[in-house]
């Protein structure tokens, strides 16, 4: 017998979030991004795993690939050739780093309903893609690039020098993948598939990080990755272009590096095709405050690529590094020479500029004390972009359309008033010529994806509204969230506070600060999330706060570049300042304040705990950086310069966690790291632990064997359970 549920009040039927809810992903949401294949058609994988083609204009849909075919090769992904004759099916997915993975690929011929036999693709393949027109294939196998005119043809081998951990063709090495390109590929088809551009990375001289992978064997394996830490030898990059119709005519032709870039260490940062015979390359000095955009043209007579100095555009920062997190990429207009690009205006806000001849003569398209964030599409008459202008909330994203066909250009916010309470953070996905687009709203309400007419902006249909999630949340006591700002010494500190469901300002609550705080990051965003901190507020009665301090993004260069060459100072100060302000609000129990963070956040939380303020009772650092000398060159030097005596060695030394070992004596510290972290190496935590032991400071630690920077799978459950116990103990909350 069970007592019947009391229905006398809504409160009684509602329950708090449980840790199990979070770990099971009970309240996860879905988004819908159409896989556009034309102006009015898209592909989507249906709930029963058929690949369905939708035509918006006729309203018709049909299955182009059945779930049976997908299942026959255990396919987890697919790609339709632009001529719609073939589909590649991807299976045996094997993750490598953040973006990279290998897989087995099968080619399915839609015309005869059979898999292509003969000249099958080798396995495993590191990257594969169709040409933008027709059904040519480019793929990378064992660090070399191959080309197929058609799926059934024998391959043409473009590069021959590929070697594991030495020479990478068409795919990035570790540091370019993680810190520069943010892709698994480093090859780019020209718009009609005439040419294929690719990068070659030579890692021969890069020092190698080695760590043990314990596995199940008698002896652990050693993982070796060429990984340039700050100040170390970097990869040598070269860009080549090959004619895919006549690949053996003159072979791959190297694209020249601008002289002002080639004079010292440099990076390649991105490649953008303009036409089949015009390409735009972006380069960056190793000291990342000078970027050069170079437009190159194909010389038919010499079969070479010519990059005249008159088509070099320099972008330089005098107050920090070039760009935001990355240097922005250009979006070319229909004249195939002028382009739109986001960079800092004279007031130090990132805005859209139109460049026709020189950067000096750039026409500013957007302006104000807010930032343009992404240019989605430029058509003959419109430019679509996102910004955080609306109502002056930096943590929002709305989509705008600027008419560029008329003068003066008029601006319209496409999303600002659509679902104002529910939706304040959007991204968009456009079909060819922006005939239609999908809007994906991430919150603060339950996410929703909708389809719109590109000319009228009219909503055509809802693609995904997360009804099941909405229903599941009906009897859940979710925490309350508020986004506000603190004004401190001419600095605006935006914060998000997550409050227990029955929050009462007259009571005292334990406070947990969740911090990331890395350069050009943003934690205070108007997005929906039901996650661990939601549970801590809902069930355990904690107040959780996220604060965007100096170094964070989308609020102008003054805030962003404040941390330049001084990582580990202002980010920490601003978290501490915010905590003091929160205490002043009167509902925080100042004896029960904790801080936690992951990665850069682990670094900041460690430094905050070791700040000697006495504010924090305890804290957690997951996979923290502990010294900038241990982290990747491309990322670290962007913000810190070089660890040399004549540059910034002093601050590299001053900003370590180890240097503050003594200060951990009066806090409870939980240090957590995966032993197979390819990104922030276990070395970082090993050094913290060693310094704490040497200082005879007690602390708690947890390692996750063979886990990388993401601590995924069963480790995730263990991690959050462990951290929950730690915090509850710290806050004297009963289990």
């Amino acid at each position: 017998l069970r007592p019947s549920r009391v229905h006398n009040s809504e409160e009684n039927t509602m329950r708090a979030l449980t840790l199990k809810d979070i770990l099971n992903g009970t309240f996860s949401y879905k988004t819908f991004f159409p896989n556009w294949i034309s102006g009015q058609e898209y592909l989507h994988q249906s709930a029963d795993n058929n690949i369905v083609l939708y035509n918006i204009e006729t309203g018709q849909s049909y299955t182009i690939l059945s779930n049976r075919t997908m299942k026959s090769v255990n396919a987890s992904n697919y790609g339709l050739s632009p001529d719609r004759q073939f589909v590649y099916l991807e299976s045996d997915y094997s993750k490598l780093w953040r973006y990279s993975y290998t897989a087995t690929y099968y080619i399915y011929d839609l015309s005869n309903g059979e898999f292509v036999r003969g000249n099958e693709l080798p396995r495993p393949i590191q990257y594969l893609c169709w040409s933008p027109v027709g059904s040519k294939l480019a793929y990378v196998y064992q660090n070399n690039i191959y080309l197929k005119q058609r799926p059934g043809d024998p391959p043409f081998q473009i590069t021959f020098n590929g070697r594991e951990n030495k020479i990478f063709n068409g795919i990035p090495d570790w540091v370019y993948e993680e810190e520069m390109l943010a892709t698994k590929y480093a090859l780019w088809w020209s718009p009609n598939g005439k040419f294929l551009a690719y990068a070659e990375f030579n890692d021969t001289d890069i020092p190698v990080i080695a760590y043990s992978y314990y596995g199940d064997e008698q002896y652990p394996r050693t993982i070796n990755i060429p990984y340039p830490k700050a100040g170390a030898k970097n990869p040598v990059v070269r860009i080549f272009i090959i004619d895919t119709t006549y690949p053996a005519y003159v072979g791959p032709q190297e694209v020249p590096v601008p002289a002002m870039i080639a004079s010292s260490d440099y990076y390649f940062s991105w490649l953008t095709w303009v036409t089949d015979e015009r390409v735009c390359l972006q380069w960056l000095k190793r000291v990342q405050n000078v970027s050069v955009l170079s437009i190159c043209d194909f010389r038919e007579d010499w079969q070479t690529w010519d990059c005249p100095k008159t088509q070099e555009h320099i972008e330089e920062s005098r107050t920090g590094w070039a760009g935001g997190f990355f240097v922005s990429t250009p979006v070319f207009s229909y004249d195939a020479i002028s382009y739109y690009k986001i960079f800092s205006d004279k007031d130090g806000y990132k805005h859209i500029h139109y460049i026709k001849d020189t950067v000096e003569n750039a026409i500013q398209i957007t302006s104000g004390k807010w930032e343009a964030i992404n240019i989605f599409r430029v058509t003959q008459d419109s430019l679509f972009y996102s910004s955080n202008e609306f109502e002056e909330y930096p943590g929002r994203r709305n989509i705008y359309r600027i008419s560029i066909g008329s003068y003066p250009p008029s601006k319209k916010c496409v999303t600002c008033h659509l679902r104002k309470e529910r939706c304040q953070y959007y991204t968009a996905s456009f079909s060819d010529y922006a005939k239609y687009y999908a809007l994906v709203c991430y919150g603060p309400g339950i996410p929703i994806s909708t389809l719109h007419d590109g000319r009228t902006d009219q909503e055509i249909k809802i693609l995904e509204e997360n009804k099941e999630l909405e229903n599941a949340l009906k009897n859940i006591q979710l925490p309350k969230e508020e986004i506000k700002k603190l004004e401190v010494d001419e600095i605006t500190l935006w914060y998000k506070m997550i409050l227990p469901p029955q929050f009462d300002r007259s009571k005292k609550y334990p406070l947990l600060i969740q911090v990331y705080g890395g350069p050009c990051s943003q934690s205070v965003r108007s997005v929906f999330a039901v996650n661990w901190i939601s549970y801590l507020a809902s069930k355990e009665g904690m107040v959780i706060a996220l604060v965007d301090g100096r170094g964070t993004a989308f609020q102008g260069d003054k805030l962003l570049y404040a941390v330049y060459r001084k990582l580990g100072v202002y980010e920490v100060e601003d978290q501490i300042t915010a905590v003091r302000k929160f205490i002043e609000m009167g509902f925080i129990d100042e004896k029960r304040i904790a801080i936690w963070g992951w990665s850069y956040g682990g670094y900041v939380s460690s430094l905050a705990l070791a700040s000697g303020t006495g504010l924090f009772k305890c804290g957690i650092a997951v996979a923290p950086v502990s010294s900038w000398e241990y982290y990747a060159s491309v990322y670290t030097e962007r913000f810190m310069g070089l660890p040399t005596k004549d540059d910034n060695l002093e601050h590299y030394k001053n900003s370590t966690v180890m240097a503050r070992a003594e200060y951990f004596r009066n806090v409870d510290y939980l240090l957590i790291h995966g032993t197979a972290d390819d990104n922030v190496h276990f070395q970082n935590s090993a050094q913290i632990a060693k310094a704490l032991v040497n200082a005879q400071v007690d602390f708690q630690a947890m390692w996750y064997s063979d886990q990388n920077h993401g601590l995924s799978g069963l480790s995730t459950n263990h991690l959050y359970t462990h951290m929950t116990h730690f915090l509850k103990q710290c806050f004297s909350l009963s289990d």
Epitope: P154, Y246, V250
Partner: antibody
């Protein structure tokens, strides 16, 4: 299955003209470089000419430059070789071949004999 | 034009023999070297492309090697149907040229 069938060969007097045809099937003709290769009686192979997939670019051996013209009709899946000012040394079996990646000849026709003699 | 020189111009061998034919280019051609087999009255047939890749349907006793200027075609164990003329061909600069051929005869 890929098939290339040449036609149009025969006996022609020096200075005369001849047009060879090659009918292609079993593959997407418009996507490939096509070529003519010849073989004089008892001799080795000699490349004659190639044409790009869309037909806008061509290449010729020095021995035939200015006299021979290669062309194609992608709607008919047919390759042509217009041979003018023929000489005795042009006597050969003419093969139509698919020139994969502009590099190797992966499929060949059975050949058509052209004899230039008075 | 790039000249291709094959050696030997002819050879006699028995069934089961290992046969090697070499081809030298007058300048470097990377790996753009192909091998063909031709029987009397028939069209040539592609055996090896890109120096070492076996064309689909060609027996595995045929193999190719080399890069730059020096290349080799090897028949690991000669079969009766392998008696024919073999040609090498370079495929660079869109100006294909053939070697003069190597005739493999029954000893």
């Amino acid at each position: 299955e890929v098939q290339l069938v040449e036609s149009g060969g025969g006996l022609v007097q020096p200075g005369g003209s001849l047009r060879l045809s090659c009918a292609a099937s079993g593959f997407t003709f418009r996507g490939y470089i096509m070529s003519w290769v010849r073989q004089a009686p008892g001799k080795g192979l000699e490349w004659v000419s190639w044409i790009s997939p869309e037909g806008s670019r061509t290449g010729y051996a020095d021995s035939v430059k200015g006299r021979f013209t290669i062309s194609r009709d992608n709607s008919k899946n047919t390759l042509y070789l217009q041979m003018n000012s023929l000489r005795a040394e042009d006597t050969a079996v003419y093969y139509c071949a698919r020139l994969q990646y502009g590099t190797w000849f992966d499929y060949w026709g059975q050949g058509t004999l052209v004899t230039v003699s008075s | 034009d790039i000249q291709m020189t094959q050696s030997p111009s002819s050879l006699s061998a028995s069934v089961g023999d290992r046969v090697t034919i070499t081809c030298r280019a007058s300048q470097s051609i990377s790996s753009y070297l192909n091998w063909y087999q031709q029987k009397p009255g028939k069209a040539p047939k592609l055996l090896i492309y890109a120096a070492s890749s076996l064309q689909s349907g060609v027996p595995s006793r045929f193999s190719g090697s080399g890069s730059g200027t020096d290349f080799t075609l090897t028949i690991s164990s000669l079969q009766p149907e392998d008696f024919a003329t073999y040609y090498c061909q370079q495929g660079t600069l869109l100006l294909p040229t053939f070697g003069q051929g190597t005739k493999v005869e029954i000893k």
